[in-house]
Amino acid sequence: APVRSLNCTLRDSQQKSLVMSGPYELKALHLQGQDMEQQVVFSMSFVQGEESNDKIPVALGLKEKNLYLSCVLKDDKPTLQLESVDPKNYPKKKMEKRFVFNKIEINNKLEFESAQFPNWYISTSQAENMPVFLGGTKGGQDITDFTMQFVSS
């Protein structure tokens, strides 16, 4: 069977939405009303990996695009990127590790930890209109907590 994928949107704990910023970057900013239609819809796939009640391995693709969030080393630093894939082969149950995030939910907080780089998380800045990035600190200035809104396919 193919991997099960569900559509969702994400907002950070400051209620910033995620939108495209150029072809290969996401940024976070506050949206209201009609502008909410700009927000990125993810296709979240439930992939193979270590799982518990609080931790579920997922891949985050952009709905109806052959782009996936992935974590790679750039200049020796774990970095978040949007990577283009062959739509004939993706998504799949056994995703390469760079595409896998541990979706961790504890006490109303939802985090996305890189499976490739433990303790590195999808992050946003406090500032408006800044890129979404992979951050190595929790509980600091940068935001690593999100809420998720599933949407009908």
Epitope: P2, C8, D54, K109
Partner: antibody, heavy 119, light 107 residues
């Protein structure tokens, strides 16, 4: 014994609001995703709201999106459904159920609370 | 949305009969299918999930089968307490939807 008990149903006029509650016992509430499922008189079942175990994830079908809000208080083992701008077609028995988006099915159900929207 | 169509809508059978209820999805749901039993005036009860796995405490006379778009709930030997309406539900993609129900009566 695993149990879910709904309350808060009643008769309400169109356009008004109602808040349903669901009290749980017999299991660790904070570890489970929860949902509300409704059944109109003589009709089938419709899933109307979902919330993840910690409360960070939600889902609403288009029929209730923007009007219904699901929430939970894990310290009190209680699930809520805030229903605003009620319509005649929202008339149904509302069931609290354990389960949701990830697991996909509902393995524990409450006895239901009836909601009638009528002028 | 994936539509779930159950057949028949109602049926009558005798105690001891083998009873079959079918559920057809409007698209492939890859065994992401559940069956529920709802006795009159009560809440639904989970019978089967993932198309063929029996839920805890469900008698072994109930079984599920099928694949792709077509699924079946079978009661091998009908008992008086099985009088109920039976619903299928898929959970392949959102929204997860239910069939319209099959009302089972005893002749």
């Amino acid at each position: 014994e695993v149990q879910l008990v709904e309350s808060g149903g009643g008769v309400v006029q169109p356009g008004r609001s109602l808040r349903l509650s669901c009290s749980s016992s017999g299991f660790i509430f904070s570890r489970y995703d929860m949902s509300w499922v409704r059944q109109a008189p003589g009709k089938g079942l419709e899933w109307v709201a979902y919330i993840s175990h910690g409360g960070a994830g939600t889902y609403y079908p288009d029929t209730v999106k923007g009007r219904f809000t699901i929430s939970r208080d894990n310290s009190k083992n209680t699930l809520f459904l805030q229903m605003d701008s009620l319509r005649a077609e929202d008339t149904a028995v509302y069931y609290c159920a354990r389960g949701g988006v990830y697991k996909g099915y509902f393995d524990v159900w409450g006895q239901g609370t009836p909601v009638t929207v009528s002028s | 949305d994936i539509q779930m169509t159950q057949s028949p809508s109602s049926l009558s059978a005798s105690v001891g009969d083998r009873v079959t209820i079918t559920c057809r999805a409007s698209g492939n749901i890859y065994d992401y299918l559940t069956w529920y039993q709802q006795t009159p005036g009560k809440a639904p009860k989970l019978l089967i999930y993932n198309a063929k796995i029996l839920a805890d405490g469900v008698p072994s006379r109930f079984s599920g089968s099928g694949s792709g778009t077509d699924y079946t709930l079978t009661i091998s030997s009908l008992q008086p307490e099985d009088i109920a309406t039976y619903y299928c539900q898929h959970f392949w993609m959102l929204p997860y939807t239910f069939g319209q129900g099959t009302k089972l009566q005893i002749t």
